[in-house]
């Protein structure tokens, strides 16, 4: 039960995280005009990964896409790549984790297969979250560097009293959305990996031994599985295998693990 809850919660947390990563990637407010200690302007600038926008006091907002690929800073391209990789991995992870969910039955899928899928999706979520966090952090670092550079030469004298005020940019809302979303995806991935450990049957689960008294045998299954009582003339020691747990001579049959789902 705890495993199902952990897996389900991991899935939901990752889903929210990936939705957040997508939202952050699409948002225009990755960097916003710094208003602190600046002349108050009737124009507000903000920039995203894909376009830059200007909002006037009049309420008019004008956005222009970055229609060049080669002319963009390498760092911006790197951030774009990291965010896209994060989204793609996260989306694949979600797809895999849907089939891996313990509460969803797909044919006669083995628990070991579900465990593997859970682990795979967990790793994908972790990498996805790390990509998003890395992308946002790279952009934030770029902003900090540019901020201090523009502060150093903020007022460029242009002969006498004429001055050019450089627009400084600070952290936009998308950065915080990205950090939180990346963190959630990471946490969700860790939860999926933890759930995988609970799903994976241990070696002892496969090799329980059935001891038969004369005409009466009791199979003890470790790990909290139900004991099963069988009657028959065969007194040989038998191995009970995961799944159908049929005996070698087909005399005894044991309940399948799937009966307890």
């Amino acid at each position: 039960m705890a495993v199902t809850a952990c897996q389900g919660l991991g899935f939901v947390v990752s889903l929210i995280g990936i939705a957040g990563i997508i939202a952050a990637t699409c948002m225009d407010q990755w960097s916003t005009q710094d208003l602190y200690n600046n002349p108050v302007t009737a124009v507000f600038n903000y920039q995203g990964l894909w376009r830059s926008c200007v909002r006037e006091s009049s309420g008019f907002t004008e956005c222009r896409g970055y229609f060049t690929l080669l002319g963009l800073p390498a760092m911006l391209q790197a951030v774009r790549a990291l965010m896209i990789v994060g989204i793609v991995l996260g989306a694949i992870g979600l797809l895999v984790s849907i089939f891996a969910l313990k509460c969803i039955r797909i044919g006669s899928m083995e628990d070991s297969a579900k465990a593997n899928m859970t682990l795979t999706s967990g790793i994908m979520f972790i990498v996805s979250g790390l990509c998003a966090i890395a992308g946002v952090s790279v952009f934030a670092n770029m902003l900090v560097t540019n901020f201090w550079m523009s502060t150093a030469n903020m007022y460029t004298g242009m002969g006498g009293m004429v001055q050019t005020v450089q627009t400084r940019y600070t952290f936009g809302a998308a950065l915080f959305v990205g950090w939180v979303a990346g963190g959630l995806t990471l946490i969700g991935g860790v939860m999926m990996c933890i759930a995988c450990r609970g799903l994976a049957p241990e070696e002892t689960n496969y090799k329980a031994v059935s001891y038969h008294a004369s005409g009466h045998s009791v199979a003890y299954k470790p790990g909290g599985f139900k004991a099963s009582t069988g009657f028959g003339s065969n007194t040989k020691n038998k191995k009970i295998y995961d799944g159908g747990a049929r005996t070698e001579d087909e005399v005894q049959s044991y309940p399948s693990k799937h009966d307890y789902v």
């Epitope: 009737a42 830059s52 006091s57 009049s58 222009r64």
Partner: antibody, heavy 118, light 113 residues
């Protein structure tokens, strides 16, 4: 068409108060800000401040804080400029103007002459 | 506050001749975000409210005759009336539309010589 119609001329004594109105028509009042501009006799234009009826934001120029209050009433699509403790130097024509994109004042009221004299 | 300095204070030009008005701002009115210059030109005739002529330094307002043109960038701007007409006699104001307060220039009076 877009119109800004201001209230009529006012003759006031020093120390009194006056409230100038600016009624907007032909557009959605809350979508655009209203600016107020003062023009003393024979002088140039002086920006006083503006209100954004959508957000409730008001911005005043440095010399127009305290005695000058900008307000609005969305139900009647009207902006107001109230001046208290009137002084002789407040004698001027007061214009309201709509703030349109490009931060331009595209439509102006006809102006209201406020005369402060004892 | 941003200081807008207009020159000359008054200008007398013959009908059909070119009139040029200059406007200088104490800080750049060029917005890096959209590469637009937030400078506006108005015309005011006696007893009338100002009329918008040009915004974004060079974009003509609809209905404004094409003899009016604006140019310049950063801190230096120019309003040009290519062929002065009798109805162009007025006072012309430039305005900073970028920084608060949205200051106006002192005005340039255009008359017929």
């Amino acid at each position: 068409q877009i119109q800004l119609v201001q209230s009529g001329s006012e003759l006031k004594k020093p120390g009194a108060s006056v409230k100038v109105s600016c009624k907007a028509s032909g557009y959605t009042f809350t979508n655009y800000g209203i600016n107020w501009v003062r023009q003393a006799p024979g002088q140039g234009l002086e920006w006083m401040g503006w209100i954004n009826p959508n957000t409730g934001e008001t911005t005043y120029a440095e010399g127009f804080t305290g005695r000058f209050v900008l307000s609005w009433d969305t139900s009647v699509s009207t902006a107001y400029l109230q001046i208290s403790s009137l002084k002789a130097e407040d004698t001027a024509v007061y214009f309201c103007a709509r703030l349109y994109y490009g931060n331009r004042f595209d439509s102006w009221g006809q102006g209201t002459l406020v005369t402060v004299s004892s | 506050d941003i200081v807008m300095t207009q020159s000359p204070d008054s200008l007398a030009v013959s009908l059909g001749e070119r009139a040029t008005i200059n406007c200088k701002s104490s800080q750049s009115l060029l917005n890096s975000g959209n590469q637009r210059n937030y400078l506006t030109w108005y015309q005011q005739k006696p007893g009338q409210p100002p009329k918008l002529l040009i915004y974004w330094a060079s974009t003509r307002e609809s209905g404004v005759p094409d003899r009016f043109s604006g140019s310049g960038s950063g801190t230096d701007f120019t309003l040009t009336i290519s062929s002065l007409q009798a109805e162009d006699v007025a006072v012309y104001y430039c305005q900073n539309a970028y920084y608060y307060p949205l200051t106006f220039g002192g005005g340039t009076k255009v008359e017929i010589k």
